[in-house]
Interface confidence: medium
């Protein structure tokens, strides 16, 4: 079953290569287990950036080596992606799945265009 997902259209990563955006979903029921996946679309290729399953009211748990962190609040997930470089600029899509209890719902946002600008190297000082 389909569900609405919203996310901001554009986000600019900071000088340390960190970008944060919000992903909101319209929960048709009282989900207790939610899975959030961040997908990156660039040059018509879609790759999975990170994913986490969480119990409502608890923190999101990503894999130890994940570049993503996040928190949840109600029907909203605050996602942070770290270690981004200019080449990582692209459309980052939020996919939300309501895993439990049944029925299963899935929604995909329109994507957040994340722009990453590599910082200029500091000039050597004499």
């Amino acid at each position: 079953k389909a569900m609405h997902v919203a996310q901001p259209a554009v986000v600019l990563a900071n000088s340390r290569g960190t970008a944060s955006f919000v992903c909101e979903y319209a929960s048709p029921g009282k989900a207790t287990e939610v899975r959030v996946t961040v997908l990156r679309q660039a040059d018509s290729q879609v790759t999975e950036v990170c994913a986490a399953t969480y119990m409502m009211g608890n923190e999101l748990t990503f894999l130890d080596d994940s570049i993503c962190t996040g928190t949840s609040s109600g029907n909203q997930v605050n996602l942070t992606i770290q270690g981004l470089r200019a080449m990582d600029t692209g459309l980052y899509i939020c996919k939300v799945e309501l895993m439990y209890p049944p029925p299963y719902y899935m929604g995909i946002g329109n994507g957040t265009q994340i722009y990453v600008i590599d910082p200029e190297p500091c000039p050597d000082s004499d």
């Epitope: 919203a6 901001p8 259209a9 909101e24 319209a26 609040s73 029907n75 909203q76 605050n78």
Partner: nanobody, 127 residues
Framework: EVQLVESGGGLVQAGGSLRLSCLAS????????MGWFRQAPGKEREFVAA????????YYADSVKGRFTISRDNAKNTVYLQMNSLKPEDTAVYYC????????????????????WGQGTQVTVSS
């Protein structure tokens, strides 16, 4: 400074419909929850409906559930309140309000969580 301008109010017979609009100036409209409140003569201002920043979650006062529908068009910086099956007790000045924090998940009906308000539009329902 963001400005909110309501329109669409007027005089309508009981059972009729009206559609209120609230146009917001500024480029950050889509980042904020929006709400509608109303104040009847001699009464306190009360919550009517709210819509989340992304437009996917809506909230209603019990007194208007099933009759009123809130929606938004982020491309037009506008939030709407479609009011059907109007009753004389819906007579009030209707105010549009913008949430106080971008991408908030507070989802509150409390007036204190709204930072900016319009001037209001009068809705009169005659019996």
């Amino acid at each position: 400074e963001v400005q909110l301008v309501e329109s669409g109010g007027g005089l309508v017979q009981a059972g009729g419909s009206l559609r209120l609009s609230c146009l917001a100036s500024g480029r950050t409209f889509s980042s904020y929850d929006m709400g509608w409140f109303r104040q009847a003569p001699g009464k306190e201002r009360e919550f009517v409906a709210a819509i989340s920043w992304g437009g996917v979650n809506t909230y209603y006062a019990d007194s208007v559930k099933g009759r009123f529908t809130i929606s938004r068009d982020n491309a037009k910086n506008t939030v709407y309140l479609q009011m059907n099956s109007l009753k004389p007790e819906d007579t009030a000045v209707y105010y549009c309000a913008r949430g106080s924090a971008p991408y908030s998940s507070s989802r509150s009906s409390a007036q204190e969580t709204y930072a900016q308000w319009g001037q209001g539009t009068q809705v009169t329902v005659s019996s």
